[in-house]
């Protein structure tokens, strides 16, 4: 829905960002005062039937009391109370609960598996290109180029651990210095936050849910971007990360440890390895300028190989080329040396779907990309549905209170730090910040976790992923130990520095405000979410990459004016909101600019025109397609998946009919029912007690 279209320009309430606000947010008024529980559901249903409730063009009349869109929805119980059930009902309800729990765990399992396969798909599609980004010699001298390469590579391979391990191997083989590697690590940190942003896009069907989910996901992006914005110049000027980590590495005499425990992989690997298995060494080899690797496939064919190390005699141009002076001889004509040759004999093929297809990497990657996104989307919808039906009444109250309530005064400030530890711990357990933040996204969307609470959890996740890297570094072989440990520590201290910048003082929690702002814009103009993703994770990095290749002069020539304009706009914006009297009347608002430069409305019209062709044929054959369809064409009835969208004329006829936003309905079941997602009959017999 678009209940508050004007919020795109609204300033968030600064009072909301005081320490402890997370738990003390004003809750939404009891909706029963506005509607008589489930009795009058018919009226809203009929109205929604008439209306293109998902059209960004539709302006919906709101109830007079406009609530804060960031308030968590009240998930009220519409089912029969436990005490009122007979024994049969209680048993049935118990088994229903167990069934839901099993389903939830099952969908969660496939959700995590699809994230893993999504990463593999991205590596197949863009892995080789990612490897080639690393072989650019300018990285050494240009930190900005290093940063964007880190972003692009991580986005392309959908795994910060892959890009970090490439950096580590390049540093250990002296192809890269630690100094040059730091910006790449910073970029990898940014790149890894795209995953949960993609996951948030899957919740596009419900405007208020999408607002929260997208803001919850992008809070990670903004934290990383802002941290880099401040810390990259600081690092370039002082090299503090390099110096601190070098001191730590040199002061400890580390012994090689054991591998970081693969906790979640143990469960997901048996399934994911049946889908596809990759030879990730290929990307590293390409990064290290190995010409042979460019023609190798990333799809692993042979899983069991016998490696036989033999020594062979080879001729060398001169004795200087000998392996060692003692392994050098002549036959009187040529100089010979002994070379260790590893002869690999293939024994058994891998057991995965693509092993015998011999398809190009791009084809396999594209197939997996589509399938994994469909599974990801389907699982997410089902998780949200199951959670929606489970998290009602008492269960919801308990969970929400537990997660979002602060410690009692004077220890309220400690709650966030505990959340950081929880985030770090959970990420350490699942061994992936992407998995943890992606699992968090739907919970933010459905209103179980506030953005204020999700923020420290996300920051903790950033820390958790670096502790995993530190453990992995301690397990690396002797020659790579120092470099991998130093890089892992750089990653760790970068995130710690970021937290110190953007968390301790509530006023500095800019990522929350920025994410909420973006959430509001994206809820109103949903195409903007995709636009944001493309701009921030592809276009900006690619532009900087291109300009960097052209040379420092070009980069500075283009970059300085752009940065100057951005600073100017920000300063003007700040003055407009804080002390407009200082400014001339003309500059006190943005009205002096043409509409297309200060509003997304004209752009929305362009996007609507562009997607018009999709709208006409917006056939929603299944919920999964439907969500993707909603995102692209903002189809009026795309989430009524029983039939194809009706003509746009009909949709436009009912555009001025005032409609009660689903947020004002008694519970999720009703609001979803109103959207044609849940059959009306089901809501009455809903079993909510677990």
């Amino acid at each position: 829905m678009a209940p508050w279209p004007e919020l795109g320009d609204a300033q968030p309430n600064p009072d909301k960002y005081l320490e402890g606000a997370a738990g003390q947010q004003p809750t939404a008024p009891d909706k029963s005062k506005e509607t008589n529980k489930t009795d009058n559901t018919e009226a809203p249903v009929t109205k929604i039937e008439l209306l293109p409730s998902y059209s960004t063009a539709t302006l919906i009349d709101e109830p007079t009391e406009v609530d804060d869109p960031w308030n968590l929805p009240t998930l009220q119980d519409s089912g029969i109370k436990w005490s009122e059930r007979d024994t049969k009902g209680k048993i049935l309800c118990f088994f229903q609960g167990i069934g839901r729990l099993i389903l939830l765990l099952g969908f969660l399992y496939f959700f995590v598996c699809s994230l893993d396969i999504l990463s593999s798909a991205f590596q197949l599609v863009g892995g080789k290109m990612a490897g080639q980004f690393f072989s650019n010699s300018s990285i050494m001298s240009n930190p900005l180029l290093g940063l964007v390469i880190g972003v692009l590579v991580t986005v392309l391979v959908q795994s910060s651990s892959t890009s970090t391990s490439i950096v580590v191997s390049m540093v250990s083989s002296s192809l890269l210095t630690v100094r040059a590697a730091i910006p790449i690590i910073m970029g990898a940190n940014i790149g890894t936050s795209i995953t949960n942003t993609i996951v948030a896009l899957m919740q596009v069907g419900d405007r208020s849910e999408f607002r929260r989910a997208f803001a919850g996901a992008t809070v990670h992006d903004f934290f990383n971007w802002l941290s880099v914005l401040v810390l990259l110049p600081v690092e370039v000027a002082t090299h503090y990360l390099e110096i601190i980590t070098q001191l730590i590495v040199e002061s400890f005499h580390f012994k090689n440890g054991e591998d970081a425990p693969d906790l979640l992989k143990v469960i997901t690997k048996p399934f994911t390895k049946l889908i596809v298995q990759l030879d990730k060494k290929v990307i590293s080899q390409i990064a290290m300028n190995d010409e042979k690797a460019k023609n190798k496939s990333l799809v692993k064919i042979w899983c069991k190989t016998f490696t036989n190390k033999t020594q062979i005699n080879v001729t060398v141009p001169s004795t200087a080329n000998c392996t060692s002076p003692s392994l050098c001889w002549t036959d009187g004509i040529q100089n010979w040396t002994m070379k260790n040759v590893t002869y690999k004999e293939n024994i058994a093929k891998c057991q995965h779907i693509f092993v015998n297809f011999h398809l190009p990497d791009l084809a396999v990657g594209t197939i997996l990309l589509i399938l994994s996104l469909l599974v990801l989307c389907g699982c997410l919808i089902m998780i949200v549905k199951i959670l929606g039906s489970v998290l009602k009444g008492q269960v919801a109250t308990v969970i929400k209170k537990t997660i979002n309530t602060d410690f009692p005064f004077p220890f309220a400030w400690l709650t966030g730090y505990l959340a950081i530890l929880v985030g770090a711990g959970m990420t350490f357990i699942v061994q992936s910040s992407s998995v943890f933040t992606s699992a968090l996204t739907p919970l933010i969307g459905i209103g179980v976790i506030t953005i204020e609470r999700a923020y420290p959890l996300t920051l903790g996740s950033n820390i958790g992923t670096t502790t995993t890297a530190i453990l992995a570094a301690l397990a690396s072989p002797g020659n790579a130990l120092r470099s991998s440990l130093q890089i892992a520590l750089c990653h760790f201290f970068f995130n710690i520095s970021g937290i110190l910048l953007w968390y301790p003082i509530p006023f500095t929690r800019l990522p929350i405000r920025m994410a909420k702002g973006l959430g509001n814009i994206s809820a109103k103009y949903r195409w903007f979410a995709v636009f944001y993703l493309i701009i921030f994770f592809f276009l900006i990095p690619l532009t900087v990459f291109g300009l960097s290749l052209a040379g420092w002069r070009v980069l500075v020539g283009v970059g300085v004016p752009v940065v100057f304009i951005i600073i100017l706009v920000l300063c003007l914006r700040l003055l407009q909101s804080r002390c407009p009297r200082v400014l001339p009347k003309k500059l006190q608002n943005w009205n002096f600019l043409p509409l297309w430069m200060r509003s997304l409305k004209p752009w929305d019209a362009v996007v609507s025109k562009f997607t018009g062709c999709f709208q006409m044929r917006c056939c929603c054959c299944c919920r999964v397609c439907c969500r993707a369809c909603c995102l692209l064409c903002d189809c009026p009835k795309c989430c009524r998946c029983s039939k194809c969208c009706e003509d746009l004329e009909e949709a436009q006829e009912g555009q001025d009919v005032p409609v009660k936003a689903p947020e004002t309905f008694d519970n999720i079941t009703i609001s979803r029912e109103a959207q044609g997602e849940v059959p009306a009959s089901d809501s009455k017999t809903e079993c909510t007690a677990l």
């Epitope: 005699n313 004795t319 002076p325 003692s326 392994l327 050098c328 001889w329 002549t330 036959d331 009187g332 004509i333 100089n335 010979w336």
Partner: antibody, heavy 120, light 107 residues
């Protein structure tokens, strides 16, 4: 079996040249390197150089560079060693030898030797 | 060039005795060393290559050892037919060089 038969003894004046031949049999001629080693009367062995008959590649001891030329005639399976600008100290028995131990400079088959005497 | 210094230059011993001839290279030659036997009026004959590998048909009383710069040829039990001059040779670098030789005689 492998046989290396060298040409007969030669008596040369200082400043002249000598061409010693070594006819091979019992193996594939182009397979092995052919070495030339000399031994002055009552002295040790001294390596002159080697030729790979398959390609004609040669390698000479720096001491003899510019004075020695080794050639191979694949049609007759014969190797020639020519030493020019002879001096009295070039008086020695000249041996041709091959190394059938691939990639090594250890020579396992030797010719009977050709005595070259340089005297005015 | 790599110099190969052989010692002793000559030795006289009895049949059945153990004979040890040493060879010292002026620089590291790894194990690229061969030993030759030359009887009076004959061409040299290869005994050992790669420091310790006996050539075909060489009796097992002949053995070689060493690496780097120091090498040894051992005749475990001297026989009358072993009377000859023994040469060491390095084939680690061009030019190939030989030791000065060790003349072995029977008392």
């Amino acid at each position: 079996q492998v046989q290396l038969v060298q040409s007969g003894a030669e008596v040369k004046k200082p400043g002249a040249s000598v061409k010693v031949s070594c006819k091979t049999s019992g193996y594939t001629f182009i397979t092995y390197n052919m070495h030339w080693v000399r031994q002055a009367p009552g002295q040790g062995l001294e390596w002159i150089g080697a030729i790979y008959p398959g390609s004609g590649d040669t390698s000479y001891n720096q001491k003899f560079k510019g004075r020695v030329t080794m050639t191979a005639d694949t049609s007759t399976s014969t190797v020639y060693m020519e030493l020019s600008s002879l001096r009295s100290e070039d008086t020695a028995v000249y041996y041709c030898s091959i190394s059938t131990i691939i990639t090594t400079g250890a020579v396992d088959y030797w010719g009977q030797g050709t005595l070259v005497t340089v005297s005015s | 060039d790599i110099q190969m210094t052989q010692s002793p230059s000559s030795l006289s011993t009895s049949v059945g005795d153990r004979v040890t001839i040493t060879c010292k290279a002026s620089q590291d030659v790894g194990t690229a060393v061969a030993w030759y036997q030359q009887k009076p009026g004959q061409s040299p004959k290869l005994l050992i290559y790669w420091t310790s590998t006996r050539h075909t048909g060489v009796p097992d009383r002949f053995s070689g050892s060493g690496s780097g710069t120091d090498f040894t040829l051992i005749i475990r039990s001297l026989q009358p037919e072993d009377v000859a001059t023994y040469f060491c040779q390095q084939y680690s670098r061009i030019p190939l060089t030989f030791g000065g030789g060790t003349k072995v005689e029977i008392k």
